[in-house]
Interface confidence: medium
C-alpha cells in the first residue's frame, strides 16, 4: 500500500476557541437535499480496510460485468482494469460490451511512485447495491499499471468521487457522480460510513466481512449518532475543508492556524492516513510523544517505519491521546471539533508476526501537499459529502472502534474568529497532487 | 496460521551435499529472521544459523561457517539451507524457527523464536 | 561466543511440586533470554521471551526472572503435561547460544 499511505495515488492542523458555546440556531436538522432515514439497500455495501482501500460493486457494460472498484475521494476519474495483471482476478473487457464508445483520447496518470495509464470511453454503468440507476460515463480503460493495484486488495478500479477541476487529462473529462446526478433524480450527495475493524483481518475476513456504507443521494441515521456538524467545502476541486485549531488530550498545538492547512486540507478516503503538513507533523508527534511517555517507542514507530506490538489484548489504548480537529462550520466565527481516538490512529496490521501479538502502525505521516484526512480518521465518523450544498458533514460513527472509556466525538458550536485567514491561497499554476 | 514447513532432509554420504526448504505462511516473512536450529540424536539444541530476508543479513554458527549457506526467496517465502561438505556429526533434526525482527517492536523487550517447524531428519552416513 | 551454562541438567518430582530450574550466561545478554519446552520427537515451543515475559498460551505456573548473566525458569505447581526437557537461550548476540537442558522427571 506504498508504505499504507495513498491507497492507491498519493505515496502515504489562529482561531482560538473560547470555551463559550453558542446556542444552536434550532434543534431540527436543516432541511437536505437528498431524501433521509432509511438506504437499506446501501448500508454495507463496501467492503475492504484502511490500509488497502474500500470498495463497492460496480457493473459495466452490456452484458454488465462485475467488478470492484475503490472509493476514493481524492481523485476524480472512473478507471477500470481493462487488460490482464498479475493482481487482478478480473477486468473490464471493452470487446465483450455492446454499449461501450471509444472516445479515441488516451489518458496518462503518474504519481511519485508509479503510475497508470489508459484508453478513454464511456458505458453504462450501475451500482447493485446502490440506487436502481444505469448512467453513462466516461470511462478510463487501464491498460497498463506500475505500483497502481494492490496484491491481494480485491478491486479492479477506482472510483473519483472529488470535482471535475482534477479529473485527467483534463476538467473537461466529467467525473461518474457529476454523470449520475445530471442523467437521473439522484440528489447531488452522498454519504460515506467507513468501518474500521480494529483489528488485523485476513483476505477471507475482508472478503466475508463488512467495511462500510456508502449511500448514493443521502443519508442514512442509523449510521451515526448524534448530530451531524457541517463545514464547508472551500473550493470545489478535492473536498477541500479549513482547519482551524488542532488539540492533542485537549492541549493546543498552538500553531498558526495557516499551517494547518498549507497547502491545503483535503477529505479523502482514498488514503490511508492522517497526512499532516511538515511543521505540524513534527509538532503533532512530539505532543503525542510527551502525552504517551509512560512507554517509550522508537523513532521508526513514529515514522511509520516500525510496527509496535503487545501481546494479544493487552494494547494500552489509555496511554495514548485523543486528537481533536477544530473545523470552520457553517455559521460566521463558529466551529466544531472533531475527535478521534488512538484506536483510528494507530492501525492494526494484518500482515504481521503472529496472530498471537497485536501490532499497530502508527498512521498519522508527514504531507509536503497539505492535511490529507484519509481512512484514519474518516474511520471516526460518518461523513456527509452535500456537494449540492457546498459542505461536509461530520457525526460519529455508529461503526467507529472505541472502549469503554473513551469515544471518537463531533462536538460544538466553539467561537472561533477570523477563520477565514486559515486558509491558504495557492498560487495558480497547473498544480495537482496527484504526483505527491 | 502461522506455519513453518521443512523440507529436504535424507540421507547423504559424507562430503556430500543437501539443500534444506523452509516454507512459511501466516507471517510477514520478510520482516522476521528465519534461524536453522539443529539437534543431534539424544542431545540439545544448536543454532545453525539466520538470516532476516528483508536485509539479507546472515549469521552462521562456526561450526558450519563456510560449508552451510542459508538464504531466502521472499517471492515464495521460503528460507534454504544450502549444506556441503557434510560430515557425521552434522547428523541430526534440522528445524526451522521464525523471530520478528526489529521491525516488530515489542514494549516489553524483543521475542524470541516463537514458531517452529516440524523438523526434517539429515543422516550423514557411509 | 557467549556459554549458556544451565543447571541441573536433569531433575525428579511430583506434580504440584515448585521447580526451579537456573542458567547463567557467560557475560550480560541483558534480557534477552527465552526458554523453552520439548517433548520427545516434537519441535521447541516458547515458554518466556525478554527473560520473564509470558508468551501468549502459556500457563501462568510458568514465570521467568533475572537480568545480565543469571536467570531463573520456575514452574510454581508442576503438571503432568510439563515433564519435559527445558532451555535457556541467549537471543541477545550472534551466535545464539542454547544451555545444555534441564530434563524434568517424574519422581
Known amino acids: 500500500t506504498q508504505h499504507g499511505i495513498r491507497l492507491p495515488l498519493r505515496s502515504g492542523l489562529g482561531g482560538a476557541p473560547l470555551g463559550l458555546r453558542l446556542p444552536r440556531e434550532t434543534d431540527e436538522e436543516p432541511e437536505e437535499p437528498g431524501r433521509r432515514g432509511s438506504f437499506v439497500e446501501m448500508v454495507d455495501n463496501l467492503r475492504g480496510k484502511s490500509g488497502q482501500g474500500y470498495y463497492v460493486e460496480m457493473t459495466v457494460g452490456s452484458p454488465p460485468q462485475t467488478l470492484n472498484i475503490l472509493v476514493d475521494t481524492g481523485s476524480s476519474n472512473f478507471a477500470v482494469g481493462a487488460a490482464p495483471h498479475p493482481f487482478l482476478h478480473r477486468y473490464y473487457q471493452r470487446q465483450l460490451s455492446s454499449t461501450y464508445r471509444d472516445l479515441r483520447k488516451g489518458v496518462y496518470v503518474p504519481y511519485t511512485q508509479g503510475k497508470w495509464e489508459g484508453e478513454l470511453g464511456t458505458d453504462l454503468v450501475s451500482i447493485p447495491h446502490g440506487p436502481n440507476v444505469t448512467v453513462r460515463a466516461n470511462i478510463a480503460a487501464i491498460t497498463e499499471s506500475d505500483k497502481f493495484f494492490i496484491n491481494g486488495s480485491n478491486w479492479e478500479g477506482i472510483l473519483g468521487l472529488a470535482y471535475a477541476e482534477i479529473a485527467r487529462p483534463d476538467d473537461s473529462l466529467e467525473p461518474f457522480f457529476d454523470s449520475l446526478v445530471k442523467q437521473t433524480h439522484v440528489p447531488n450527495l452522498f454519504s460515506l460510513q467507513l468501518c474500521g475493524a480494529g483489528f488485523p483481518l485476513n483476505q477471507s475476513e475482508v472478503l466475508a466481512s463488512v467495511g462500510g456504507s456508502m449511500i448514493i443521494g443521502g443519508i442514512d441515521h442509523s449510521l451515526y449518532t448524534g448530530s451531524l456538524w457541517y463545514t464547508p467545502i472551500r473550493r470545489e476541486w478535492y473536498y477541500e475543508v479549513i482547519i482551524v485549531r488542532v488539540e492533542i488530550n485537549g492541549q493546543d498545538l498552538k500553531m498558526d492556524c495557516k499551517e494547518y492547512n498549507y497547502d491545503k486540507s483535503i477529505v479523502d478516503s482514498g488514503t490511508t492516513n492522517l497526512r499532516l503538513p511538515k511543521k505540524v507533523f513534527e509538532a503533532a508527534v512530539k505532543s503525542i510523544k510527551a502525552a504517551s511517555s509512560t512507554e517509550k517507542f522508537p523513532d521508526g514507530f513514529w515514522l511509520g517505519e516500525q510496527l509496535v506490538c503487545w501481546q494479544a489484548g493487552t494494547t494500552p489504548w489509555n496511554i495514548f491521546p485523543v486528537i481533536s480537529l477544530y473545523l470552520m462550520g457553517e455559521v460566521t466565527n463558529q466551529s466544531f471539533r472533531i475527535t478521534i481516538l488512538p484506536q483510528q490512529y494507530l492501525r492494526p496490521v494484518e500482515d504481521v508476526a503472529t496472530s498471537q501479538d497485536d501490532c499497530y502502525k502508527f498512521a498519522i505521516s508527514q504531507s509536503s501537499t497539505g492535511t490529507v484526512m484519509g481512512a484514519v480518521i474518516m474511520e471516526g465518523f460518518y461523513v456527509v459529502f452535500d456537494r449540492a450544498r457546498k459542505r461536509i458533514g461530520f457525526a460519529v460513527s455508529a461503526c467507529h472502534v472505541h472502549d469503554e472509556f473513551r469515544t471518537a466525538a463531533v462536538e460544538g458550536p466553539f467561537v472561533t474568529l477570523d477563520m477565514e485567514d486559515c486558509g491558504y491561497n495557492i498560487p495558480q499554476t497547473d498544480e495537482s497532487t496527484l504526483m505527491t | 496460521e502461522v506455519q513453518l514447513v521443512e523440507s529436504g532432509g535424507g540421507l547423504v554420504q559424507p562430503g556430500g551435499s543437501l539443500r534444506l526448504s523452509c516454507a512459511a505462511s501466516?507471517?510477514?516473512?520478510?520482516?522476521?529472521?528465519i534461524h536453522w536450529v539443529r539437534q543431534a540424536p539424544g542431545k540439545g539444541l544448536e543454532w545453525v544459523a539466520s538470516?532476516?530476508?528483508?536485509?539479507?543479513?546472515?549469521s552462521y554458527a562456526d561450526s558450519v561457517k563456510g560449508r552451510f549457506t542459508i538464504s531466502a526467496d521472499t517471492s515464495k517465502n521460503t528460507a534454504y539451507l544450502q549444506m556441503n561438505s557434510l560430515r557425521a556429526e552434522d547428523t541430526a533434526v534440522y528445524y526451522c524457527?521464525?523471530?520478528?525482527?526489529?521491525?516488530?517492536?515489542?514494549?516489553?523487550?524483543?521475542?524470541?523464536?516463537?514458531?517452529w517447524g516440524q523438523g526434517t531428519l539429515v543422516t550423514v552416513s557411509s | 561466543d557467549i556459554q549458556m551454562t544451565q543447571s541441573p541438567s536433569s531433575l525428579s518430582a511430583s506434580v504440584g511440586d515448585r521447580v526451579t530450574i537456573t542458567c547463567r550466561a557467560s557475560q550480560s545478554v541483558s534480557s534477552a533470554v527465552a526458554w523453552y519446552q520439548q517433548k520427545p520427537g516434537k519441535a521447541p515451543k516458547l515458554l518466556i521471551s525478554?527473560?520473564?515475559w509470558l508468551y501468549s498460551g502459556v500457563p501462568s505456573r510458568f514465570s521467568g526472572s533475572g537480568s545480565g548473566t543469571d536467570f531463573t525458569l520456575t514452574i510454581s505447581s508442576l503438571q503432568p503435561e510439563d515433564f519435559a526437557t527445558y532451555y535457556c537461550q541467549q537471543y541477545s548476540y550472534s551466535p545464539f547460544t542454547f544451555g545444555q537442558g534441564t530434563k524434568v522427571e517424574i519422581k
Open positions: 501466516g507471517f510477514n516473512f520478510y520482516y522476521s529472521s
Open positions: 524457527a521464525r523471530q520478528p525482527t526489529h521491525y516488530y517492536y515489542y514494549a516489553k523487550g524483543y521475542k524470541a523464536m516463537d514458531y
Open positions: 538470516i532476516s530476508p528483508y536485509s539479507g543479513y546472515t
Open positions: 525478554w527473560a520473564s
